[in-house]
Interface confidence: medium
């Protein structure tokens, strides 16, 4: 079972070789496409392969902001050629992500296909790591091999790479081991219950609040740190402000996501940025700690 997601992919190419990407769609180059063209071939060692975010079968929804669906295959190819002259193309791509059934906690193995010079899409963090503590996956690039498996998420502990234990391994060495891996990489992962934002832990409830700005401020102040796994919390509400008037948001509530973008593994600065660019309608996923009896 899969679900689809979209991402933006920026490729740097050159006028002579292009981006190493071949598209396929329709029967004739001049017929209007009824569905987005597919990536049918990725040239080895090309910008398209090296970015690590594209796979054969991905749907290209737009090229440099121009929708492909109502155009022709010839027009799509021309857009790519024109982009190559400028060395850069921005593709909006739709792809499939596996719906993995995985426990919210426990230790398991993940196998990922790996090619030379192609990143897996995993960022490792060693922020405030004490000796003997595991490395933490702090970010997973959207569209990457790691993301498409559907099993990995920020906050997962990375215990081993290809049976090489990482107990006392410096982060730089772990990154190097990941880079040098080829063909198939086996990652040993541990998920902890406290990593699962979705998990309704005892005495906590999570829900979504939609705020319509109408050009005004949200009326919330948030706090946290630049440590990727410290919680982002509501630290202040403007009196009679938009957020306070909902009655659903209170000081001390934890923000799990902003406009469906999870804050897991993200520092305070990124959360602030997400709020700044959120637009007129802002959806906040909130986790509230319910009062416990003494």
């Amino acid at each position: 079972i899969v679900h689809t997601e979209t991402t933006e992919v920026v490729l740097c190419g050159d006028p002579l070789s292009g981006f190493g990407l071949q598209l396929q769609g329709g029967i004739f180059a001049t017929e209007t496409l009824s569905s987005p063209p597919l990536v049918c071939f990725i040239e080895p060692d090309s910008p398209a392969e090296r970015c690590g975010l594209l796979q054969v079968g991905d749907r290209v929804l737009s090229i440099n902001g121009i929708a492909t669906e109502d155009g022709t295959m010839e027009e799509a190819n021309q857009l790519l050629r024109d982009a190559a002259l400028a060395h850069k193309v921005v593709l909006e791509v739709e792809f499939d992500v596996a719906e993995s059934v995985i426990p919210s906690s426990g230790t398991f193995h993940v196998k990922l296909p790996k090619k030379r010079s192609v990143e897996l899409g995993i960022t490792i963090s060693s922020a405030s790591r004490k000796r003997g503590e595991p490395l933490i996956i702090s970010d997973i690039k959207k569209g990457s091999v790691a993301h498409r498996t559907g099993t990995l998420e920020p906050g997962d502990k990375l215990l081993a790479i290809d049976n090489i234990r990482l107990d006392n391994c410096p982060m730089e060495d772990a990154v190097q081991i990941l880079r040098q891996c080829e063909d198939l990489v086996k990652l040993k992962i541990r998920k902890d219950e406290d990593n699962s934002d979705e998990l309704e832990t005892t005495g906590a409830v999570s829900y979504t609040v939609e705020l319509k700005r109408y050009g005004g401020p949200l009326g919330i102040t948030i706090s946290g740190t630049e440590e990727p796994f410290d919680p982002i919390v509501i630290s202040g509400l403007t009196k009679r402000g938009l957020a306070e008037r909902t009655g659903a948001i209170h000081v001390g509530d934890r923000i799990l996501a902003i406009n469906n973008v999870s804050l897991k593994g993200r520092p305070l600065s990124e959360a602030i940025h997400l709020l700044q660019v959120a637009g007129e309608t802002v959806t906040l996923k909130i986790k509230k700690q319910l009062d416990r009896p003494l």
Partner: antibody, heavy 117, light 107 residues
């Protein structure tokens, strides 16, 4: 195995013409852009010209623009460099090379062009 | 046109030495920088492409780094067969210019 074999070099008088060829094998020729690079005796490398895989786009160094023409015949797996109005400073070993996104990954052994009266 | 400037133009070193050659572009070329090795009477050979990627079959003692305008080729431990001339080349925009070369000689 990728192979590039240049031919057509030789001695030519100033103002004369010469046509270099580069026979390619071991890869899908039409899928790759190709380039000519030259090296004057005892000097460094100088990029001369390049052509896209389809032959639709061509590029030249300022020093040869208007005098040299790069072309290809994908049915014959051959790259060409037509050199007209040759000058003494065009004397060099001419290499053909395959362009693979980030660099010239395969080179021929070179053919010497000498322009002298 | 983008000018590529290599330094030094010549260099004497011994087997086992660590050697660094630098290349500077007159404008930003992102990571579109390649390094070649050429021995007398032979065609150049691609060593490093895209600033830091090792070409297949090239020994791991060769490495490249940099982006934008400043780039470095490093040979971690010189071997007898490494004595040659090294060229950088930008493939960011045509004309695809080369540096003037660095001749690596035995001390």
């Amino acid at each position: 195995e990728v192979q590039l074999l240049e031919s057509g070099g030789g001695l030519v008088q100033p103002g004369g013409s010469l046509r270099l060829s580069c026979a390619a094998s071991g890869f899908t020729f039409s899928s790759y852009a190709m380039s000519w690079v030259r090296q004057a005796p005892g000097k460094g490398l100088e990029w001369v010209s390049a052509i896209s895989g389809s032959g639709g786009s061509t590029y030249y160094a300022d020093s040869v623009k208007g005098r040299f023409t790069i072309s290809r015949d994908n049915s014959k797996n051959t790259l060409y460099l037509q050199m007209n109005s040759l000058r003494a400073e065009d004397t060099a070993v001419y290499y053909c090379a395959r362009i693979h996104f980030y660099g010239l990954d395969y080179w021929g052994q070179g053919t010497l062009v000498t322009v002298s009266s | 046109d983008i000018q590529m400037t290599q330094s030094p133009s010549s260099l004497s070193a011994s087997v086992g030495d660590r050697v660094t050659i630098t290349c500077r572009a007159s404008q930003s070329i992102s990571s579109y920088l390649n390094w070649y090795q050429q021995k007398p009477g032979k065609a150049p050979k691609l060593l490093i492409y895209a600033a830091s990627s090792l070409q297949s079959g090239v020994p791991s003692r060769f490495s490249g780094s940099g982006s934008g305008t400043d780039f470095t080729l490093t040979i971690s431990s010189l071997q007898p067969e490494d004595f040659a001339t090294y060229y950088c080349q930008q493939s960011y925009s045509t004309p695809y210019t080369f540096g003037q070369g660095t001749k690596l000689e035995i001390k």
